[in-house]
């Protein structure tokens, strides 16, 4: 899995989208979890409605909300009133029984001010063993990183 970086401004809301194959994940609940360390668990933050047919209903845990468009195949997580400690590694997951498939790995970064981040074209230049690809922009400040750029936690 590549990792997608989503950057948001402190105090504002950040919307994270996780696209998936709606047929492959038909009937499955989804979850948003935070990776606690390279080898640590992915701690559940919030999950979609217990009844899959009601997955479109927004569920909240504190300032984090989740909703699932099961037909379109897009899981959406909203982090309201973004705070510095919301920065970190997360996963969108598809649940089946006691197992969880990773839909997307997400790196959330919190900006002090819109002017305090560098544009993708002005990032640090990776070394020879690393690579960076400005693969796509889903939001004004979202991008994908290749597997080689930073070490990724295992799927839990």
């Amino acid at each position: 899995h590549n990792t997608t970086v989503f950057q948001g401004v402190e105090g504002q809301s950040l919307q994270v989208s996780c696209p998936y194959d709606s047929m492959k994940h038909w009937g499955r609940r989804k979850a948003w979890c935070r990776q606690l360390g390279e080898k640590g668990p992915c701690q559940r933050v919030v999950s979609t409605h217990n009844l899959w047919l009601l997955s479109f209903l927004r569920r909240r845990n504190g300032s984090t909300a989740i909703t699932d468009d099961t037909l379109g195949g897009t899981l959406t997580i909203t982090l309201r009133n973004l705070q510095p400690h919301d920065a970190g590694f997360y996963q969108c997951q598809s649940l089946h029984g006691s197992e969880a498939d990773t839909l997307r790995k997400v790196l959330v970064e919190v900006l002090a001010d819109p002017l305090d981040h560098r544009d993708a074209g002005d990032l640090w230049v990776p070394g020879e063993s690393e690579s960076f690809e400005d693969a796509h922009v889903e939001h004004s400040i979202s991008r994908s990183l290749l597997e080689g750029e930073i070490p990724f936690p295992p799927t839990s």
Partner: antibody, heavy 121, light 107 residues
Framework: QVQLVESGGGLVKPGGSLRLSCAAS????????MSWIRQAPGKGLEWVSY????????YYADSVKGRFTISRDNAKNSLYLQMNSLRAEDTAVYYC??????????????WGQGTTVTVSS | EIVLTQSPATLSLSPGERATLSCRAS??????LAWYQQKPGQAPRLLIY???NRATGIPARFSGSGSGTDFTLTISSLEPEDFAVYYC?????????FGGGTKVEIK
């Protein structure tokens, strides 16, 4: 063991430039946000700047914004602070520190020994 | 900017006594407060994070408490090596800030 070693400090004239370096070892450098903190002689601690794991998110204190530039090279396990237009009030011991969160912010759980920057004519 | 005010500025105590250091924030920092110890000529050392969690290798005589705006660092029984300057620091909101420090000196 986990270690941070700063270098590059010295005596510089007002308006001059200096580049500090911090070499990290004993941990996966690219997993962590890194920061620079300074301490003027006989004074308390002041947060100067931090940089995210990938280098894409940066924060500067107002007192150094526009004059200092933080950067990192994950391939070399190194953190840098380019200091331009130095002023007498920038005289301090500069510490490199690791933020304890996994790809995130957190308390500074590992510190370097510090490097002294003196700005004087 | 969140201002952290530490009190007292200096605490004069004898080894074996209990030390109580205070840190007050100008607005709520939830539990995102850390305590550091600094000895002369040395770098600061993390003691407590998230208001009450001891960092790795920190003796049990150090404890932290509080949330919101009022925080306390307690050293249950001072050892000779505990005489130093102690700083609190918040990482709840930008810009991250430190308190002015409390010096714990031998009486």
């Amino acid at each position: 063991q986990v270690q941070l070693v700063e270098s590059g400090g010295g005596l510089v004239k007002p308006g001059g430039s200096l580049r500090l370096s911090c070499a990290a070892s004993g941990f996966t450098f690219s997993d962590y946000y890194m920061s620079w903190i300074r301490q003027a002689p006989g004074k308390g601690l002041e947060w100067v700047s931090y940089i995210s794991s990938s280098g894409s998110t940066i924060y500067y204190a107002d007192s150094v914004k526009g004059r200092f530039t933080i950067s990192r090279d994950n391939a070399k396990n190194s953190l840098y602070l380019q200091m331009n237009s130095l002023r007498a009030e920038d005289t301090a011991v500069y510490y490199c520190a690791r933020l304890g969160g996994y790809y995130s912010l957190g308390p500074m759980d590992v510190w370097g020994q510090g490097t002294t920057v003196t700005v004087s004519s | 900017e969140i201002v952290l005010t530490q009190s007292p500025a200096t605490l004069s105590l004898s080894p074996g006594e209990r030390a109580t250091l205070s840190c007050r924030a100008s607005q709520s920092v939830s539990s995102y407060l850390a305590w550091y110890q600094q000895k002369p000529g040395q770098a600061p050392r993390l003691l407590i994070y998230d208001a009450s969690n001891r960092a790795t290798g920190i003796p049990a005589r150090f404890s932290g408490s509080g949330s919101g705006t009022d925080f306390t660092l307690t050293i249950s029984s001072l050892e000779p090596e505990d005489f130093a300057v102690y700083y609190c620091q918040q990482d709840s909101a930008f810009p991250f800030t430190f308190g002015g420090g409390t010096k714990v000196e031998i009486k």
